[in-house]
Amino acid sequence: REEAKPYPLFPGPLPGSLQTDHTSLLSLPHTSGYQPALMFSPTQPGRPYTGNVAIPRVTSAGSKLLPPLAFKHTVGHIILSEHKDVKFNCSISVPNIYQDTTISWWKDGKELLGAHHAITQFYPDDEVTAIIASFSITSVQRSDNGSYICKMKINNEEIVSDPIYIEVQGLPHFTKQPESMNVTRNTAFNLTCQAVGPPEPVNIFWVQNSSRVNEQPEKSPSVLTVPGLTEMAVFSCEAHNDKGLTVSKGVQINIKAIPSPPTEVSIHNSTAHSILISWVPGFDGYSPFRNCSVQVKEVDPLSNGSVMIFNTSASPHMYQIKQLQALANYSIGVSCMNEIGWSAVSPWILASTTEGAPSVAPLNVTVFLNESRDNVDIRWMKPLTKRQAGELVGYRISHVWQSAGISKELLEEVGQNNSRAQISVQVHNATCTVRIAAVTKGGVGPFSDPVKIFIPAHGWVDHAPSSTPAPGNA
């Protein structure tokens, strides 16, 4: 009969399965594990050995002992070329008293399960059945390399065959190929190439820009020391063995240079004293950007033409330029550096800051009580604002009323043409504190120093004004 099965391949060491007779014999179970049987080899009388021995008890006649079961010898070391087909087998003769024998295949300690092409054939005779387990591999690959064994389970015992080592020979196989590199001009560097067989040895030739570098091959692994390059080059390595030649990938070795200038410098946001810019980095010159420099020049015929330099990280490609004058025009450029040096400056772009808030407070603030109208009169002088602060659009008046632990702040806005205002008395028997700030489109300027006036209860009259002195009048 013939039985086709998907077969498994070879686990780690089996306790006590020492084999010295190039046969795999079965060990008998014992309370403490495997109990090797001491016996004499049938092929070498008188030479004791221990093995995985299956000692059949008695025949059907019930008298004579049967010889130990063992797989027959076979070719142990099979060498073949990649993509060839191979077939190998294990054979054993089993007395017919044994039932339910199963053979499994193992490879490098792991059972071979699944769609492997394994066939077991049975040839029964009067007393014994010859069993041949065949294993075939079509178009062998490198991954088929390894030790294959058969195992036969018989009456819960295990018989292990001698190994069959399959050696698949083919073209060299790279385990390490040269890597692309960016190198400094005229500076030495190393490239590594490693390939394996079988067959070995594997010899390495190096190739630079399609020309061989070494006349004599080097044994794998090989390290090529290149004394230095002045221009880009492509390197590869050839691995040779008795089966032929394999060529590695070609790798480009680039020469580090200064970066190209950044491009597309853009303005994202402008305020009175800052400008947010971004840029597109140029080519990095085969060396990572380290940092960038933002250069800022004031475009003003009256300025001294000095350049402000702001250093920033190379990433993100954005920078907020601060400490700028309000309502001013600037020319902005960006340069970036790598380990070799600085790029040229990007094309310059023009940018402007917006109006700023006033930098000084209104002057000569005076406050007095107009009791008849139940309000407070406030007067001031227009501040001396700079051009950059922009056009005055009005004033903001803050008046705080404090009485018996209660405090309330109110804000009033008045137009730019005014230099006086009236506010209603909010609380009697209280202190009113007044501050005034100038307002432009750029924002609210600083508040004047506070001026306090006491608002008495009804009937008390005090016309004396409170005021802040003008600068220099103190």
């Epitope: 190039h22 390894g146 190994p163 080592y165 070995e200």
Partner: antibody, heavy 122, light 111 residues
């Protein structure tokens, strides 16, 4: 790929001695490494081997007298525990022929070191 | 352990001649047998493995044969460079151990 033995010297009997095999371009997690010795004017004598998995096997005569261990990714040591004058020899380390993370394999020797001389004398 | 017995211990032959070295294993080792060449002051060099397979770079004048317990190395068209000591090695192994052993060596003298 290369191997080099070191540590060979003159010692008195009974003085433990450790020899080191340093490999270059060989992955010891893929290849087995064996030790073989050769007494002056005599033949090669197999001592033992350490597989890629770290399992060690010794010739019967060498058991208990020698210890093989992997001490780093590039070095394998052979310790001679209690040398006698009969252990005077050149000691070679050699790489097994086949790669593979297995405890057992067909370990003939493909690449050899130049050897290191050990002299045991009073 | 497996014992490898090599014969003869020494052999002399003329340039262009043929030398045959025999190696016997104390038990069957299938074809797990290698042959090495060793010259004075040098480590051994593998010539043949799997009993008959020529190692890379080895001239085809070297031929290995045999299986089981009996093995032969034949060197034909002998050259002066072939003067060396030759060793056989069993590298038989099982699923639980390995059985490495060298033969005693054969000195080949080329005259």
């Amino acid at each position: 790929q290369s191997l080099e033995e070191s540590g060979g010297r003159l010692v008195t009997p009974g003085t433990p001695l450790t020899l080191t095999c340093t490999v270059s371009g060989i992955d010891l997690s893929s290849y087995a490494l064996g030790w073989v010795r050769q007494a002056p004017g005599k033949g090669l004598e197999y001592i033992g081997i350490i597989s890629s998995t770290g399992t060690t096997y010794y010739a019967t005569w060498a058991k208990g007298r020698f210890t093989i261990s992997k001490t780093s990714s590039t070095t394998v040591d052979l310790k001679i525990t209690g040398p006698t004058t009969e252990d005077t020899a050149t000691y070679f380390c050699a790489r097994g022929a086949y790669a593979g993370y297995v405890a057992f394999g067909p370990y003939y020797f493909h690449i050899w070191g130049p050897g290191t001389l050990v002299t045991i004398s009073l | 352990d497996i014992v490898m017995t090599q014969t003869p211990a020494s052999v002399e032959a003329a340039v262009g001649g043929t030398v045959t070295i025999k190696c016997q294993a104390s038990q069957s080792i299938s074809n797990f047998l290698a042959w090495y060449q060793q010259k004075p002051g040098q480590p051994p060099k593998v010539l043949i493995y799997a009993a008959s397979h020529l190692a890379s770079g080895v001239p085809s004048r070297f031929k290995g044969s045999g299986s089981g317990t009996q093995f032969t190395l034949t060197i034909s068209d002998l050259e002066c460079a072939d003067a060396a000591t030759y060793y056989c090695q069993s590298y038989f192994y099982s699923s639980t151990s390995i059985y490495n052993a060298f033969g005693g060596g054969t000195e080949v003298v080329v005259r």
